[in-house]
Amino acid sequence: QTDPELTIMTRLGQVQGTRLPVPDRSHVIAFLGIPFAEPPLGKMRFKPPEPKKPWNDVFDARDYPSACYQYVDTSYPGFSGTEMWNPNRMMSEDCLYLNVWVPATPRPHNLTVMVWIYGGGFYSGSSSLDVYDGRYLAHSEKVVVVSMNYRVSAFGFLALNGSAEAPGNVGLLDQRLALQWVQDNIHFFGGNPKQVTIFGESAGAASVGMHLLSPDSRPKFTRAILQSGVPNGPWRTVSFDEARRRAIKLGRLVGCPDGNDTDLIDCLRSKQPQDLIDQEWLVLPFSGLFRFSFVPVIDGVVFPDTPEAMLNSGNFKDTQILLGVNQNEGSYFLIYGAPGFSKDNESLITREDFLQGVKMSVPHANEIGLEAVILQYTDWMDEDNPIKNREAMDDIVGDHNVVCPLQHFAKMYAQYSILQGQTGTASQGNLGWGNSGSASNSGNSQVSVYLYMFDHRASNLVWPEWMGVIHGYEIEFVFGLPLEKRLNYTLEEEKLSRRMMKYWANFARTGNPNINVDGSIDSRRRWPVFTSTEQKHVGLNTDSLKVHKGLKSQFCALWNRFLPRLLNVTENIDDAERQWKAEFHRWSSYMMHWKNQFDHYSKQERCTNL
């Protein structure tokens, strides 16, 4: 006999879940591996997902689904620091499933919903990782937690413009379809479809930002949390031309003959998934740190324009956002190729390695651009100091790829709350759902921005000390893992985790991290709104809440203002100079030819053929 608490009728059919224990001798109910799309197999590879068709039997949703096909990091096969991010389930193209954790309250009703989107550079990630276990957050904050798998790498982001067979961005469309599933079904699980916060980290946060920008995604959720990622910035999107170049290169690498788009896609579909994964890194045009092969593409559909242009014009969802960064966003990426860096030593960096590393970190910059970066990040009284060179590299990679794009995103969002506040009243703690339109066309803006800097290094971290507070290592605190005694966190870390879960859930419920479930506000520890002028943000660590102003403003002025302009101006100079040299060469050849002809003519004794 089936337990009614564990069996739920959804729009598509019945699903059976399971009870999972949580630390205080209680439990949550989990539905793991619910299908939300038809398996994207065969002809469906590279194509947008199709909604799952109904089923008749009870669907067994008691265990995590397969992970989507992806590159696996085998750099250190015996090291949990890398292994924790690798898929812990078999990989398959049949991977479009989602998970739901429901607090074990009697008949949960209209609970706030938090939907997690994993990161992994758009080339990796899976919803089944231990660090994304939704049970602790669901139980502690009485919210419904959802996470989904989405296609990554070429399977999710291979794009050939003009082709319905591989339009690109299908991994984002997988996420959107899961959000639609939540709208259609979450009330069966006691969740409120009008109170859905999407949250993610790194490429997952970039995805969250993309749904804030993408007009067709905006109505499918209420609010957004972005952890160490935004949709703008150097690695998150490519042009259609670049996406096409990479698709063609992948075809060549796996032995597909040159031909038209249809032939190429048919050939790529005939290959084993692992064949595509094995070649994916080789399609990059240059080797750089924090660069990934198959990422979202500016397609004119999912993205009407570039994220930068949409941000600048206020073309984004009018709602509240909470976002932030970790103290050492760059360190993780340095050990994957920057000269002199290793997790297995102190990574004391020579000046020569530093200069080489800067080149790898900003691969699109010309000489003068690199010089600007070096100038900004060098202590010229101590330029050979190996510790300072190491820390500068950490800052360069982190600021360029995470911190400064996020600061820009926050400022653009906050700026529109001011602009709209002048034509209406900005509502900072609004409990409503926000409109699904743009910030720029709403006289009564609901935009408010909350920003954090996470700067606590976990006591049980397996990575070396010099790597600091690493990219991705706030996630375990957001998901409440420190509540699990066997994981060896300190009591202070458990308290920090409880605080962070409360902030995140308060924000999801009300749009304000300070407003508790009962409506009270802890006046001693108030997290202020981030504005584009003051840029107030909080430090999240085991100390009491501290408010800071300006998030790396000096450094972000380089990345967000000066460097783009410098490259724009000097790139034009370089182009003009190249063009001038080519023209001059042609002109010289012509003049030489003319001179020879004239010399020949002048040597003639008399004019002929007159």
């Epitope: 085998t74 090291f79 994964i277 070649q279 080789l282 297995d344």
Partner: antibody, heavy 125, light 106 residues
């Protein structure tokens, strides 16, 4: 059946060179990381070098004791693994094993799951 | 580099006895691997990832441990278990082996 067969060992003078080969069969060679491990007479095991697969850009790692003297390489089309040993020293005298690293999809992931019979290298004047 | 120290270097046991050998790491590692080698033969994988027995390894063997301290145990030793056992870590480069524990059967 997985097979690893080493060859190329022998007697060589100090400062001399030698190239070891390992013929692999019975598995999809190009998807596996491969290693050389050595064992001096009557002593324990010492890891020498690792080469990863093409999807990992054939990245290599070496033990400090052989760095800048030994070079590990592979030829996926011939399913061959090589170890080029230059500037040999007497302390390089050992049995050299060609070893496969278990792949992510195997239960043996991360372990040295198949070993050849070894080829003996003696460095002596 | 991480140094692995195995103890004892040599141990002797009678058939049916329980034996335990240890492997101590100079800094914390996530997993330990164990190999078994008989004289004149190549090493064979014995225990994967701290506690998973390789195929064909008798159930009387077990592995355990965490952090810097790991062990391999045999619940009831048999004559065929005489061999040298090596621990190995792959937590960081360079990969390292312990010096080995030689198990002799009386």
């Amino acid at each position: 059946e997985v097979q690893l067969v080493e060859s190329g060992g022998g007697l060589v003078q100090p400062k001399g060179s030698l190239k070891l080969s390992c013929a692999a069969s019975g598995f999809t060679f190009n998807t596996y990381a491969m290693h050389w491990v050595r064992q001096a007479p009557g002593k324990g095991l010492e890891w020498v070098a690792r080469i990863r697969s093409k999807s990992n850009k054939y990245a290599t790692h070496y033990a400090d004791s052989v760095k800048d003297r030994f070079t590990i390489s592979r030829d996926d089309s011939q399913t061959m693994l090589y170890l080029q040993m230059n500037n040999l020293k007497t302390e390089d005298t050992a049995m050299y094993y060609c070893v496969r690293e278990g792949s992510y999809y195997d239960s043996s992931y991360g372990a040295m799951d198949y070993w050849g019979q070894g080829t003996s290298v003696t460095v002596s004047s | 580099q991480i140094v692995l120290t195995q103890s004892p270097a040599i141990m002797s046991a009678s058939p049916g006895e329980k034996v335990t050998m240890t492997c101590s790491a100079s800094s914390s590692v996530s997993y330990m691997y164990w190999y078994h080698q008989k004289p004149g033969s190549s090493p064979k994988p014995w225990i994967y990832r701290t506690s998973n027995l390789a195929s064909g390894v008798p159930a009387r063997f077990s592995g355990s441990g965490s952090g810097t301290s790991y062990s391999l145990s045999v619940s009831s030793v048999e004559a065929e278990d005489a061999a040298t056992y090596y621990c190995q870590q792959y937590n960081s480069h360079p990969m390292t082996f312990g010096g080995g524990t030689k198990l002799e059967i009386k």
